[in-house]
């Protein structure tokens, strides 16, 4: 019968008694940087080409015996998970292995760098189809390793890495912390984060998604037809490398940004029990478990968006945090969040010719996060329109005045320390969808975009008094591009997008008493691409 | 994911205006930085990745590596160039004493230097 992990990543329409998704990733080459591998294992024979690359440190300990099957264990299993004949994700993918980990599973940053350089040189000498690089390893944060990953990603290579098995913030490890790399955490058959002894899967904003990573059946180097069950974020990353190979084989022209957005879009949402994560990491950690798309033909017509959290700003009075989108993505909105509620909002600003999302801490605040909504919007022309504080009682307003431009997001930023001490504005009048409204003492920023067939609408959900959180979701066929709160009182901790839902968090003041003036509204901006949607319906 | 400011140790060593009367003095006011792994047991002191500025050519990387070796030798230190990087990042991998870091950070074209560290199968 089909192993649990393959069943979990397979959409229901492909589930039979056997895992048989269409196309096995045959147009894609997957590079594996790991231990040595048993290349003639029945699961992977003829599928893996062992390169002559080897850069490993000597094994620790004077009495260490190099037992071949132990030396090959990790890499053989992962090669089997990616492309194994019986238990692999992408059975048609061909692989190339580089040895960067020794018989104890240990390597160096420098050895990994030289391995990545070897891949780049191979790519230049003999350009092939799409390349996926699997890095089932982790070390401490390394600027140079992250930089090398960035360069390789910008050369069109998809890098997939393990989040790490340290039950810690993945941002403290490399290559997991490299923004260009697809970083994968591990979940088990119960969709719980994987516990590994006293530790477990890493988490946090540097994780892109999770994948099966406990009791994963794969090729064992004990014998050529043996199987073994292994666990870890390496196994999870191998699943995503396999899924990426399948997606790229179906759509070889996909960019890294498009692939990442699709991986997120087709993931199972909100199935992970977040209670396992430290409380301060829950909001930052994506609740996504990787899955294959329901069809090999892409969903190019869809408007894909993802949420990118910044690093924490730190607590100083003028501290700011910046969230950035990938080079191929458009920043369609910007919001901010602070656990203490002390913040001075956020703004979209140009940095190096690209829009970024900057959040501002307030005096006495413990720090803020900036939250960018990053979307794939081909042929988009986006700009930010700003209105300075109105000072008048009606609040500050700004709208998209250019012909054909639609509102995709609203941000507000204020210099006063606490908007809550000032009379909040009235809510935005109805029937003006292309307008952002905010506190009279705040400057308001509207993200206005022109793109073929782009249409957007505003959805609101308000409750009379803050009760922890208010949400509003975009309906089927629409994608959340903007998420903000009305009004910007001190009760509001911030707003952020979770998949297609806008979440506004506020302090629960039900115990301290509240007035109707303190109503909180979650404002979602939902968009879709009209002409692409129509084109897809005609195809169906 | 992580931006420039990760949770890792950074030593910023100011560049002096002249070093051994170099012909190629570094650009005025720039500061090369030194990085090492925040997790002490994972550090591999004695091996360093010297990363050069983005547009540095292979020949300049090789020249910078040779210059480091020559200057180290004048101070009585042995160094070994283990690898010259090109294709992804310009730079080189060097086995040397940590005493030479200050000297290395003052070399022309140097962007930053990172001490080697361990990575592990996950």
């Amino acid at each position: 019968s089909i192993p649990w992990n393959l069943e979990r990543i397979t959409p229901p329409r492909y589930r039979a008694d056997e895992y048989q998704p269409p196309d096995g990733g045959s147009l894609v080459e997957v590079y594996l940087l790991d231990t040595s591998i048993q290349s003639d294992h029945r699961e992977i024979e003829g599928r893996v080409m062992v390169t002559d690359f080897e850069n490993v440190p000597e094994e620790d300990g004077t009495r260490f015996h190099r037992q071949a099957s132990k030396c090959d264990s990790h890499g053989t299993h992962l090669a089997g998970v990616v492309s194994g004949r019986d238990a692999g994700v992408a059975k048609g993918a061909s692989m190339r292995s580089l040895r960067v980990l020794n018989c104890q599973g240990k390597g160096t940053v420098s050895g990994t760098l030289i391995g990545l350089e070897f891949i780049r040189k191979s790519q230049l000498v003999q350009p092939v189809g799409p390349l996926v690089v699997l890095l089932p390893l982790a070390g401490g944060y390394s600027r140079v390793l992250n930089a090398a990953c960035q360069r390789l990603a910008r050369a069109g290579v998809v890098l997939v890495t393990a989040a790490g098995n340290f039950r810690d913030d993945a941002c403290l490890y490399s290559p997991a912390s490299a923004p260009e790399v697809i970083t994968v955490g591990a979940t088990n058959a119960q969709d719980q984060p994987v516990t590994l002894g006293t530790l477990g899967t890493n988490f946090g904003r540097c994780v892109d998604l999770f994948a099966p990573g406990e009791d994963i059946i794969g090729a064992s180097s004990d014998c050529s037809t043996c199987f073994v069950s292994q666990s870890g974020t390496s196994q999870a990353a191998a699943h995503v490398a396999g899924i990426a190979a399948m997606m790229l084989s179906a759509e070889p022209e996909l960019t890294l940004a498009e692939l990442r957005q699709r991986l997120i879009h087709f993931s199972a949402k909100d199935v992970i029990n977040e209670a396992w994560f430290p409380e301060d990491q829950r909001v930052l950690t994506p609740n996504l478990v990787a899955a294959l798309p329901p069809s090999t033909h892409g969903a190019g017509w869809q408007l894909f968006c993802r949420t990118v959290w910044s690093a924490h700003s730190g607590p100083t009075r003028m501290a700011t945090a910046i969230a950035r989108c990938a080079p191929d993505e458009e920043l369609l909105s910007c919001s901010s969040f602070s656990r203490s509620g002390k913040r001075r909002g956020e703004r979209m600003e140009a940095q190096g010719g690209k829009l970024v999302c900057r959040a501002h801490n307030a005096f006495g605040g413990e720090g803020v996060y900036a939250i960018a909504r990053c979307c794939l919007l081909p042929q988009a022309n986006c700009s930010v329109h700003t209105a300075p504080p109105a000072e008048a009682s009606m609040g500050t307003r700004v709208h998209c005045h250019q012909q054909g431009h639609v509102l995709t997001g609203c941000s507000s930023h204020w210099e006063v320390e606490d908007l809550g001490t000032h009379k909040p504005p009235v809510l935005r009048p109805r029937g003006q969808p292309n307008q952002c409204v905010g506190h009279r003492e705040a400057s308001i920023h509207a993200s206005c975009c022109h793109a073929p067939g782009l249409e957007c609408k505003v959805k609101e959900h308000g409750i009379p008094a803050p009760q922890g959180q208010v949400t509003v979701a975009c309906e089927e066929g629409w994608t959340l591009t903007g998420c903000s709160a009305l009004p910007g009182t001190s009760h509001v901790l911030g707003a952020y997008a979770v998949d297609n839902t806008c979440v506004v968090r506020s302090r629960d003041v039900s115990t301290t008493g509240s007035t109707s003036e303190e109503a909180v509204t979650a404002v979602a901006i939902c968009c879709r691409s009209r002409h692409l949607a129509q084109a897809s319906q005609e195809l169906q | 994911q992580e931006d420039e400011d990760g949770d890792y140790e950074e030593l910023v060593l100011a560049l002096r205006s002249e070093e051994d009367g170099l012909a190629e003095a570094p650009e005025h006011g720039t500061t090369a930085t030194f990085h090492r792994c925040a997790k002490d047991p994972w550090r591999l002191p004695g091996t360093y990745v010297v990363v050069l500025k983005e547009e540095t050519h292979l020949s300049q990387s090789e020249r910078t590596a040779r210059r480091l070796q020559a200057q180290a030798a004048r101070r009585g230190y042995l160094t070994k160039i283990l690898h010259v990087f090109h294709g992804l990042l310009p730079g080189f991998l060097v086995k040397m004493s940590g005493d030479l870091l200050e000297l290395a950070l003052k070399l022309p074209h140097v962007d930053y230097i990172e001490e080697d560290s361990s990575v592990f199968a996950q």
């Epitope: 024979e45 062992v50 059975k91 | -």
Partner: antibody, heavy 115, light 116 residues
Framework: QVQLVQSGAEVKKPGASVKVSCKAS????????ISWVRQAPGQGLEWMGW????????NYAQKVQGRVTMTTDTSTSTAYMELRSLRSDDTAVYYC????????WGQGTLVTVSS | QPVLTQPLFASASLGASVTLTCTLS???????VDWYQQRPGKGPRFVMR????????SKGEGIPDRFSVLGSGLNRYLTIKNIQEEDESDYHC?????????????FGGGTKLTVL
């Protein structure tokens, strides 16, 4: 192109041993193991076992276990199959085939066991 | 372990089509089966692998497009269209079973195809 070239025909007496060689070319030898299959006159195919060209691990069919030894020499990309204590019912054409996939086969070596 | 059953003989006229069957024993419906062609006096030649979803991987070297496979339940079929004289051969099917020390390869008895 991929080729498996086997040694020539052998005539052996019962109780003797035979060693058949199989020289591989046209691919990376250590990326595929070698399977050995035999075919008695007028009969179907019978699997004898497999050897890893990577680490020398073997997997033998129960019927020949204890009498068969499979080895490889990676320096010459050659696999060997030795069968001991030959009996008349070991008379067959012996084939080597590439890996578990068995996608390429040698031309066969006829071993005749006769007193 | 599975048992593979093949009819001893099959025949077809030149230019016609023929379907050869290899049947797995009960309980092995998910198994992949390999088809081999063996011309008189020659060694076996890999044709292709088949499971219930059809071909697995790619055809053997030099196998013409006239050869195709299908799988349904316990049956694995090899169909040859527009039969030529050079297709007159024995056709064997084989399957892998088990893992570790229990691993075996089993073959069917073979089907002798005659071109009329």
């Amino acid at each position: 192109q991929v080729q498996l070239v086997q040694s020539g025909a052998e005539v052996k007496k019962p109780g003797a041993s035979v060693k058949v060689s199989c020289k591989a070319s046209g691919y990376t030898f250590t990326s595929y193991g070698i399977s050995w299959v035999r075919q008695a006159p007028g009969q179907g195919l019978e699997w004898m076992g497999w050897i890893s060209t990577y680490n020398g691990n073997t997997n033998y069919a129960q019927k020949v276990q204890g009498r068969v030894t499979m080895t490889t020499d990676t320096s010459t990309s050659t696999a060997y199959m030795e069968l001991r204590s030959l009996r008349s019912d070991d008379t067959a054409v012996y084939y080597c085939a590439r890996g578990y996939t068995r996608d390429y086969w040698g031309q066969g070596t006829l071993v005749t066991v006769s007193s | 372990q599975p048992v593979l059953t093949q009819p001893l003989f099959a025949s077809a006229s030149l230019g016609a089509s023929v379907t050869l069957t290899c049947t797995l024993s009960s309980g092995y419906s998910s198994y992949e089966v390999d088809w081999y062609q063996q011309r008189p006096g020659k060694g076996p030649r890999f044709v292709m692998r088949v499971d219930t979803g059809g071909i697995v991987g790619s055809k053997g070297e030099g196998i013409p497009d006239r050869f195709s496979v299908l799988g349904s339940g316990l049956n694995r079929y090899l169909t040859i269209k527009n039969i030529q004289e050079e297709d007159e051969s024995d056709y064997h099917c084989g399957a892998d079973h088990g893992s570790g020390t229990n691993f075996v390869v089993v073959f069917g008895g073979g089907t002798k195809l005659t071109v009329l």
